[in-house]
C-alpha cells in the first residue's frame, strides 16, 4: 500500500477520504487506527457503527469522527481541533471477523496555524448563536508519499 | 439462481501439471469472493484460499501457499485452481464455494458450493 | 491457527430424536461460527451462520447456540433427510478452518 499524506492546520478539522471498492467489502464495518512504530501494532481509535447498515451515522471518540459511504464506496475520518500529536501515520481498515484489511495507509501532518502570531484583535470568534463546528473550516490537502519517502525516522 | 458449476473428474500422474475450474451464474460473479476447499477421501474439509474475482486479490492458506495456484477470468465468471507439479497426496475432491458477507456481523460464509472435481493422481 | 474440535465424532439416533452436536474453537471466536451439512458424495451445505442465524430454505428444527469458544448445533426432531456429517467452521481469522466432521448415523 502507498501512504497518502494529509496535511491540517493546528486547532482546525481535518478530513481524512479513504475510497474502496464498495462490492469488495459490502457488509463489512470499518476502523480508523493509528500505527504505532514502523512495524508495531494498528491501535484503534474509532469504528463505525456496529450495524452494518447503520455505518453512515457518524460516530465519535473524543475528536475523532468516521462515517462510512458503503454505496458509494468512500470511508470519512474527521480530526477536530488537529494538534501536533496528531501527526503520525495511520490505516484505514475494512473489518471481517476479527481481521483487518487496510484500505489505505495515511500520513497525517499538522501545519502550524498561521494565525497564531498575530494579535488576539485580528482573530475572528463565532457568537454565541454560532456553533463552533459551523466556525471550522475543513482543511485537507494529500499526497502520496514520494518513493524513498519513510513515514517513521529511522530506529538506530 | 446460483450456481456454481465445477469441470469434471480428472486422473493425473504424478509431476504433472492441471487446471479445474468453477463457473459461476445467476449472480454478479465480481461481487463475491470465491473460495476453495480440500476433502481428501474419508476425511474433513479445508480451506485453501480465496480470490476476489474482481480485482483478482488472493489469500492463500499457509498450508496451500506456495502449493497451489488460485484465479479467475472475470469475462467468463470462472475461477480456476491449479498445480504445476501434481502429487500422490493431492488425491481429493476439490470443491469451490462463493463467500457471502453477512451484514450482521460482518464476517463471511461459503453459501453456495460447486459440486467437486474429484482429482486422483496416481502412477 | 484456530483450532476447531467437534464431539462426538459420530452418534446413532432415531427418526424423530433430538440431538446436540458441540464444537470448541482453540481461542475466543466471538460468534463467527458456521454450520454446514454434508450428505455421501455431495457438497456441503449451510444450515447457521453467525452461530444462530438459520440460512435461508433450512428448516426450523435446526438452530445454533453459543459465542467464544463453545458452541452448539440442535436438531429438535430428526427427519430422515437429516442423517449426513456435520462441520462447524470458524469465520474469525485466515486460515478459516473446520470441525472433523461429527457423523449422524440411524440407530
Known amino acids: 500500500h502507498n501512504t497518502t499524506v494529509f496535511q491540517g492546520v493546528a486547532g482546525q478539522s481535518l478530513q481524512v477520504s479513504c475510497p474502496y471498492d464498495s462490492m469488495k467489502h459490502w457488509g463489512r464495518r470499518k476502523a480508523w487506527c493509528r500505527q504505532l512504530g514502523e512495524k508495531g501494532p494498528c491501535q484503534r481509535v474509532v469504528s463505525t457503527h456496529n450495524l452494518w447498515l447503520l455505518s453512515f451515522l457518524r460516530r465519535w471518540n473524543g475528536s475523532t469522527a468516521i462515517t462510512d459511504d458503503t454505496l458509494g464506496g468512500t470511508l470519512t475520518i474527521t480530526l477536530r481541533n488537529l494538534q501536533p500529536h496528531d501527526a503520525g501515520l495511520y490505516q484505514c481498515q475494512s473489518l471481517h471477523g476479527s481481521e483487518a484489511d487496510t484500505l489505505r495507509k495515511v500520513l497525517v501532518e499538522v501545519l502550524a496555524d498561521p494565525l497564531d502570531h498575530r494579535d488576539a484583535g485580528d482573530l475572528w470568534f463565532p457568537g454565541e448563536s454560532e456553533s463552533f463546528e459551523d466556525a471550522h473550516v475543513e482543511h485537507s490537502i494529500s499526497r502520496s508519499l514520494l518513493e524513498g519517502e519513510i513515514p517513521f525516522p529511522p530506529t538506530s | 439462481e446460483v450456481q456454481l458449476v465445477q469441470s469434471g473428474a480428472e486422473v493425473k500422474k504424478p509431476g504433472e501439471s492441471l487446471k479445474i475450474s468453477c463457473k459461476g451464474s445467476?449472480?454478479?460473479?465480481?461481487?463475491?469472493?470465491i473460495a476453495w476447499v480440500r476433502q481428501m477421501p474419508g476425511k474433513g474439509l479445508e480451506w485453501m484460499g480465496t480470490i476476489y474475482p474482481g480485482d483478482s486479490d488472493t489469500r492463500y492458506s499457509p498450508s496451500f501457499q506456495g502449493q497451489v495456484t488460485i484465479s479467475a477470468d472475470k469475462s467468463i465468471s470462472t475461477a480456476y485452481l491449479q498445480w504445476s507439479s501434481l502429487k500422490a497426496s493431492d488425491t481429493a475432491m476439490y470443491f469451490c464455494?462463493?463467500?457471502?458477507?453477512?451484514?450482521?456481523?460482518?464476517?463471511?460464509?461459503?453459501?453456495?458450493w460447486g459440486q467437486g472435481t474429484l482429482v486422483t493422481v496416481s502412477s | 491457527d484456530i483450532q476447531m474440535t467437534q464431539s462426538p465424532s459420530s452418534v446413532s439416533a432415531s427418526v424423530g430424536d433430538r440431538v446436540t452436536i458441540t464444537c470448541r474453537a482453540s481461542q475466543g471466536i466471538s460468534s463467527w461460527l458456521a454450520w454446514y451439512q454434508q450428505k455421501p458424495g455431495k457438497a456441503p451445505k449451510l444450515l447457521i451462520y453467525?452461530?444462530?442465524s438459520l440460512q435461508n430454505g433450512v428448516p426450523s428444527r435446526f438452530s445454533g447456540s453459543g459465542s467464544g469458544t463453545d458452541f452448539t448445533l440442535t436438531i429438535s426432531s430428526l427427519q430422515p433427510e437429516d442423517f449426513a456429517t456435520y462441520f462447524c467452521?470458524?469465520?474469525?481469522?485466515?486460515?478459516?478452518?473446520f470441525g472433523q466432521g461429527t457423523k449422524l448415523e440411524i440407530k
Open positions: 453467525a452461530a444462530s
Open positions: 467452521q470458524q469465520a474469525d481469522s485466515h486460515p478459516r478452518t
Open positions: 445467476g449472480y454478479s460473479f465480481t461481487s463475491y469472493w
Open positions: 464455494a462463493r463467500q457471502r458477507t453477512f451484514y450482521y456481523d460482518s464476517s463471511d460464509y461459503f453459501d453456495y
